[in-house]
Interface confidence: low
């Protein structure tokens, strides 16, 4: 990355000595061009072997001058090989070459770590022509270096379909240590060992690490980066950080809080969202999780009726979404509800208990002991029953619904009667003679109509028959009682 200027370093010399062709130091360039970045190499020489006095690549031209004198080999001149500087300083370096004037259209490109630097606006190529040769100086400047500018820079020149490569110029940007790995916040079990890691790099190396716990240094002797701190265990929350030191100074990591896992706080704001005859939908706001994720919650339900046996119903559910529908409750009943949640450490205390009520429901059982008999003198059918047990009425009884079906010679007719809640008998007029009357009764509350009783059948004879007897709800096991008179 080529960054904008903040400070300038001392300039490096453009080239170490005079060029062939008596190039004077006060020559001004006839032409100064920005770096041409569109060029792609056609041929690259292999790197020079170690031990050679000049590590750049050399091109031996195949052409001769008018007098047939062979031209000398072309090579970039030696320049500074290693530049060390601090972050944010400026740097300028160059490569230079003298090219016989017989060559046209020479192009110099800059490369860093094997990749061409395209669009690098701080590269300038200057041409100094003379009688026989042109001195070419390619300068590269970075106005405010950063770590990403570290690397090996070279010049390449394309000439005669071959490439000449300069010696590398190594740029080493030094600065304060830079963290590549910092300690992370953790939630740990009390008195259980855990590790924290800290890693920082230069240059300059080495980088040494000190650990700090609650503003106090943990290790008297620094450790070389990377460093792993093993903490044998904590009994209370602590804040850790690490200091990274090198010759340029010190950098401090972020402070991280190490929390001790504990049982959760009890849930708060337990609320009734919806209530039906046999269920209650509740929600709650979880308490503090004790630095350990909630696993599940327990809803505890007890009857608020002082006459109840005080037993507690337990319903387990997942910790999310802080909602639960409590089912299998009695209608028109009061309940106390509490919520407790657990994490890996244990269960929270129970939330403050809240009072909730179920609504009225339809009765869950039918009237009992239904009996039916024919009162022939008044041409009525008398029906008697016992009301269902109070517990199973699921609300305040408002009456009964009587279904009576008359069947005769393939014709069937159903009639419904509504009866008030007082009393346990009713009288219906005979609808058809020489027919079967089937009676069923259901209890009714404001919550709805309960189940109908088992059918009770009675035969209504033609006029003039005298004897009759009642018909009643069968004993268990008798499926379809019919009393024929």
């Amino acid at each position: 990355a080529i960054t904008e200027a903040r400070e300038e370093a001392k300039p490096y010399p453009l080239f170490p000595g005079p060029f062939p062709g008596s190039l004077q130091t006060d020559h001004t360039p006839l032409l100064s061009l920005p770096h041409a970045s569109g060029y792609q190499p056609a041929l690259m020489f292999s790197p020079t072997q170690p031990g050679r006095p000049h590590t750049g690549n050399v091109a031996i031209p195949q052409v001769t001058s008018v007098e047939s004198k062979p031209l000398p080999p072309l090579a970039f001149k030696h320049t500074v090989g290693h530049i060390i500087l601090s972050e944010h300083k400026g740097v300028k370096f160059n490569c230079s070459i003298s090219v016989p004037n017989i060559y046209q259209d020479t192009t110099i490109s800059w490369w860093k770590d094997g990749k061409e630097l395209l669009g690098a606006h701080h590269a300038i190529t200057q041409f100094y022509p003379d009688d026989e040769v042109t001195a070419i100086i390619a300068s590269f400047s970075i106005t405010s270096v950063q770590r990403s500018d570290n690397g090996s820079y070279i010049c390449k020149m394309k000439i005669n379909n071959e490439e000449i490569v300069s010696d590398p110029i190594y740029i080493e940007v030094q600065g304060l240590p830079h963290f590549t790995k910092q300690p992370e916040s953790m939630n740990v079990t009390r008195n259980t060992a855990f590790n924290l890691t800290c890693q920082a790099v230069g240059p300059p190396e080495p980088v040494n690490i000190f650990w700090v716990q609650n503003s106090s240094r943990v290790n008297e002797q620094p450790e070389k980066s990377p460093s792993v701190l093993t903490v044998p265990g904590l009994t209370e929350m602590a804040v850790f950080s690490c200091e990274a030191h090198n010759d340029k100074g010190l950098t401090v990591s972020k402070g991280v809080q190490i929390n001790i896992k504990a049982i959760p706080s009890p849930p708060t704001e337990v609320s009734i969202r919806n209530s039906t005859a046999h269920s209650i939908l509740i929600s709650w706001v979880p308490g503090f999780d004790g630095y350990s994720p909630f696993r599940n919650c327990s809803i505890q339900v007890k009857e608020a009726d002082p006459l109840s046996n005080g037993s507690v119903m337990i319903f387990n559910t997942s910790a999310l979404p802080h909602l639960y529908q409590i089912k299998q409750l009695q209608a028109l009943a009061n309940y106390s509800i509490g919520v407790s949640c657990m994490n890996e450490i244990g269960w929270s205390a129970v939330s403050p208990w809240i009072l909730a009520s179920t609504t009225e429901g339809a009765p869950s059982v039918a009237p009992l002991n239904v009996t039916v008999f024919l009162n022939e003198s008044s041409d009525n059918v008398d029906i008697r029953w016992m009301k269902p047990p109070t517990k199973q009425q699921d609300g305040e009884l408002v009456g009964y619904r009587i279904s009576h079906v008359w069947q005769s010679a393939g014709i069937s007719k159903e009639l419904l009667e509504e009866v008030g809640q007082n009393g346990s008998r009713a009288r219906i007029s005979v609808q058809v003679h020489n027919a079967t009357c089937t009676v069923r009764i259901a209890a009714v509350t404001r919550g709805g109509v309960g189940p109908f009783s088992d059918p009770v059948k009675i035969f209504i004879p033609a006029h003039g028959w005298v004897d009759y007897a009642p018909s009643s709800t069968p004993a268990p096991g008798n499926a379809d009682p019919v009393l024929i008179i």
Epitope: S185, Q257, P264, S265, E269, S271, R273, S283, V285, P286, G287, F288, D289, P293, F294, P321
Partner: antibody, heavy 122, light 106 residues
Framework: QVTLKESGPGILQPSQTLSLTCSFS??????????VGWIRQPSGKGLEWLAH???????YYEPALKSRLTISKDSSKNQVFLKIANVDTADTATYYC??????????????WGTGTTVTVSS | QIVLSQSPAILSAFPGEKVTMTCRAT?????MHWYQQKPGSSPKPWIY???NLTSGVPARFSGSGSGTSYSLTISRVEAEDAATYYC?????????FGGGTKLEIK
């Protein structure tokens, strides 16, 4: 982008009822986990939480003011309302509404309105 | 109710100094939240759940604490940090704020 904007009468007289409206955008009060609260600040003094309302219509009030406060919402219009009955000069303040961030085990006011100034004066 | 006491009420510091303000609760709270308010502006959430910085808050700020004692620390104060900082608990109704610490830059 979440924004909240308070509106109110500006000036009212002692014993009147103060009605405030918080109009918001960028979130819905029908969505799981959403809540909006009211906070006030007398000039030059600190902040005082007044009330908040959750997406499922549960309401919570500052106990000392509970008898005078009513919070409500119209989720379809993205509005929350606060009424303060029987105001007196001590209710003169800047009133803020703020969205509540509902974390797994914590809550805080994560976006605040710009506030509306209310003066109670005879 | 839980009362939050912030100290000091006014804190003066030079740029570059490290400052710490504290918030003490009369009963234990799960988490402490901190808000920054500048004159004429509404409060901004600054630190939530004791030590988490909200988006855009510089890393020189940090929060810590547990139980009844919490603190907000600025490692190197800058001029833009001048404001009043309020702590706030959401553990027990009423959900109270501290009285604030006003940070002045010399």
């Amino acid at each position: 982008q979440v924004t909240l904007k308070e509106s109110g009468p500006g000036i009212l007289q002692p014993s009147q009822t103060l009605s405030l409206t918080c109009s918001f955008s960028g979130f819905s009060l029908s969505t799981f986990g959403m809540g909006v609260g009211w906070i006030r600040q007398p000039s030059g003094k600190g902040l005082e939480w007044l009330a908040h309302i959750w997406w499922y219509d549960d309401k919570y009030y500052e106990p000392a003011l509970k008898s005078r406060l009513t919070i409500s919402k119209d989720s379809s219009k993205n509005q929350v309302f606060l009424k303060i009955a029987n105001v007196d000069t001590a209710d003169t303040a800047t009133y803020y509404c703020a969205r509540i961030y509902y974390g797994t085990s914590y809550r805080y006011f994560d976006v605040w309105g710009t506030g509306t100034t209310v003066t109670v004066s005879s | 109710q839980i009362v939050l006491s912030q100290s000091p009420a006014i804190l003066s510091a030079f740029p570059g100094e490290k400052v710490t303000m504290t918030c003490r609760a009369t009963s234990s709270v799960r988490y402490m939240h901190w808000y920054q308010q500048k004159p004429g502006s509404s409060p901004k959430p600054w630190i939530y759940a004791t030590y988490n910085l909200t988006s855009g808050v510089p890393a020189r700020f940090s929060g810590s604490g547990s139980g009844t004692s919490y603190s907000l620390t600025i490692s190197r104060v800058e001029a833009e940090d001048a404001a009043t900082y309020y702590c706030h608990q959401w553990s027990s109704n009423p959900y109270t704020f501290g009285g604030g610490t006003k940070l002045e830059i010399k």
